[in-house]
C-alpha cells in the first residue's frame, strides 16, 4: 500500500477548490474496509495503481481515502418532479490527483488520474445502510454498486427483486 501523506497535504486546499463546478459540502478522511473487516488497499504496480481487498497484518497501517461529499438529485426518471429529493454523492481519492472510477464496460473499479472537473464515473451515490455501513452506487449506472469480487473491487448489479446477499456491497468507514 502506498503512503497517503499527500492526502492530508491537499485536504485543506480542496475545501476551496471546484471539482464539478461546485464545492464539496464536506470531506472525510477515512479507511475503507469490507463488511467482513478486510481492508481496501492501494498499491503502485507497473506505473499504475491496483486496488486490493486483503487482511492486514497486525499493526499494519490502513490506507486512507478522502471522501468528498456533494449534494445531488436522484438520477432516475422518478425524480422528475423532485419528489425523490436530494442525495449525497461522494468521490473517493486515496492519493493526490487520483480518484476511484467506475468502468461500467469492464465491470471494474479503477484508480484514474483526473483533471477537474471530474467525470461522472468518479461519482457514487452514498447509501446509508444499517450496521454502520455504507454502499456506493455508480452515478453513471443506477443499480450498480462497488462490491468485492475475488479479493478485488468490482461493479456489481443489485436488483431489489432478487434474493441476493449484499454483504459484498457493504463497506465500513473508519477514522482509524
Amino acid at each position: 500500500a502506498f503512503g497517503i501523506s499527500g492526502v492530508q497535504k491537499y485536504t485543506r486546499a480542496l475545501h476551496d477548490s471546484s471539482i464539478t463546478g461546485i464545492s464539496p459540502i464536506t470531506e472525510y478522511l477515512a479507511s475503507l474496509s469490507t463488511y467482513n473487516d478486510q481492508s481496501i488497499t492501494f498499491a503502485l504496480e507497473d506505473e499504475s495503481y491496483e486496488i486490493y481487498v486483503e487482511d492486514l497484518k497486525k499493526d499494519e497501517k490502513k490506507d486512507k481515502v478522502l471522501l468528498s461529499y456533494y449534494e445531488s438529485q436522484h438520477p432516475s426518471n422518478e425524480s422528475g418532479d423532485g419528489v425523490d429529493g436530494k442525495m449525497l454523492m461522494v468521490t473517493l481519492s486515496p492519493t493526490k490527483d487520483f480518484w476511484l472510477h467506475a468502468n461500467n464496460k469492464e465491470h471494474s473499479v479503477e484508480l484514474h488520474k483526473c483533471e477537474k472537473p471530474l467525470p461522472d464515473q468518479a461519482f457514487f451515490v452514498l447509501h446509508n445502510m444499517h450496521s454502520n455501513c455504507v454502499s456506493f452506487e455508480c452515478k453513471t449506472d443506477p443499480g450498480v454498486f462497488i462490491g468485492v469480487k475475488d479479493n478485488h473491487l468490482a461493479l456489481i448489479k443489485v436488483d431489489s427483486s432478487e434474493n441476493l446477499c449484499t454483504e459484498n456491497i457493504l463497506f465500513k468507514l473508519s477514522e482509524t
Epitope: 459540502i25 464536506t26 470531506e27 472525510y28 477515512a30 471522501l67 461529499y69 436522484h74 432516475s76 422518478e78 425524480s79 419528489v83 425523490d84 429529493g85 436530494k86 442525495m87 449525497l88 451515490v125 452514498l126 447509501h127 446509508n128 445502510m129 444499517h130 454502520n132 455504507v134 443489485v158 436488483d159 431489489s160 427483486s161 432478487e162 434474493n163 441476493l164 446477499c165 449484499t166 468507514l173
Partner: antibody
Framework: EVQLVESGGGLVQPGGSLRLSCAAS????????MNWVRQAPGKGLEWMAE??????????HYAESVKGRFTISRDNSKNTVYLQMNSLRAEDTAVYYC????????????WGQGTLVTVSS | DIVMTQSPDSLAVSLGERATINCRAS??????????LNWYQQKPGQPPKLLIF???SQGSGVPDRFSGSGSGTDFTLTISSLQAEDVAVYYC?????????FGQGTKVEIK
C-alpha cells in the same frame, strides 16, 4: 404523482388489535425503505418502525415502546406496507403516518396524510 | 437512545425578522463525516415536510430563507426572513441510530 395513502385506523378497545395499511403509488415501491411515524393528539412526532428491502433481508427495526407488540411488513407485489398492532394501550392513541425514506436512506421525504387510531374503552 | 432537545418551545417573530431554533443531542449524531440531523416543518392538519438534511443541506424545493448549521451535538435552524406561511411547528430529528428520535418541537408564530 408520488402518494402514500393510509387506511385501517379507527376505535379499538385496550388490549385489542388493528392492522394499518399504506398503499404506495407513483414510484418503484420495492426500492425504498418504509417507516411508520405516529403523533399523539397535540403532541410531537414519534418514530415507530422501519422495514428495508429484499436485498437487506427485509430487516425491521422498532421503537422500544412498541417492540414485541407491533409488526411492520411489506408486500411489494401490492405496493403496500403494513403495521400490525397488538395489545393496544390508551397511550397508542395517535395519528399514524406512513413515510418513505429517500433514495440512499438519509431522511424521510414522502409522507401519507395519516390515519387516526383511538384506543379507548 | 439519543435524546433530542429543542429550544425554545415556542417563538414569536415579526414578519421579515430572523427566527432561530436550537436543537441539542444527548450524544454526537455525527457518522461517516456528516451529521445525521434533519429538520422538518409541520403545519396544522398536515404531515411533516423535510427542510434540511445532514444538518445543513436544503431539501428539494425548500426556500433559501431556511438554513441549517451545526455538528456533533449542537444544531441550529434559521429562517432568515419570516414569512406568514412559515407559521408551523419545527422538529429536529436524528437518523444516526435506531430508534430515530425527534425533538419535542418548536412552535413558530407571528408577533
Amino acid at each position: 404523482e408520488v402518494q402514500l395513502v393510509e387506511s385501517g385506523g379507527g376505535l379499538v378497545q385496550p388490549g385489542g388489535s388493528l392492522r394499518l395499511s399504506c398503499a404506495a403509488s407513483g414510484f418503484t415501491f420495492s426500492n425504498y425503505w418504509m417507516n411508520w411515524v405516529r403523533q399523539a393528539p397535540g403532541k410531537g412526532l414519534e418514530w415507530m418502525a422501519e422495514i428495508t428491502l429484499k436485498f437487506n433481508d427485509y430487516s425491521t427495526h422498532y421503537a422500544e415502546s412498541v417492540k414485541g407488540r407491533f409488526t411492520i411488513s411489506r408486500d411489494n407485489s401490492k405496493n403496500t406496507v403494513y403495521l400490525q398492532m397488538n395489545s393496544l394501550r390508551a397511550e397508542d392513541t395517535a395519528v399514524y403516518y406512513c413515510a418513505r425514506r429517500n433514495y440512499g436512506n438519509w431522511y424521510i421525504n414522502v409522507w401519507g396524510q395519516g390515519t387516526l387510531v383511538t384506543v379507548s374503552s | 437512545d439519543i435524546v433530542m432537545t429543542q429550544s425554545p418551545d415556542s417563538l414569536a417573530v415579526s414578519l421579515g425578522e430572523r427566527a432561530t431554533i436550537n436543537c441539542r443531542a444527548s450524544e454526537s449524531v455525527d457518522k461517516f463525516g456528516v451529521s445525521f440531523l434533519n429538520w422538518y416543518q409541520q403545519k396544522p392538519g398536515q404531515p411533516p415536510k423535510l427542510l434540511i438534511f445532514v444538518a445543513s443541506s436544503q431539501g428539494s424545493g425548500v426556500p433559501d430563507r431556511f438554513s441549517g448549521s451545526g455538528s456533533g451535538t449542537d444544531f441550529t435552524l434559521t429562517i432568515s426572513s419570516l414569512q406568514a406561511e412559515d407559521v408551523a411547528v419545527y422538529y429536529c430529528q436524528q437518523s444516526k441510530d435506531i430508534p430515530y428520535t425527534f425533538g419535542q418541537g418548536t412552535k413558530v408564530e407571528i408577533k
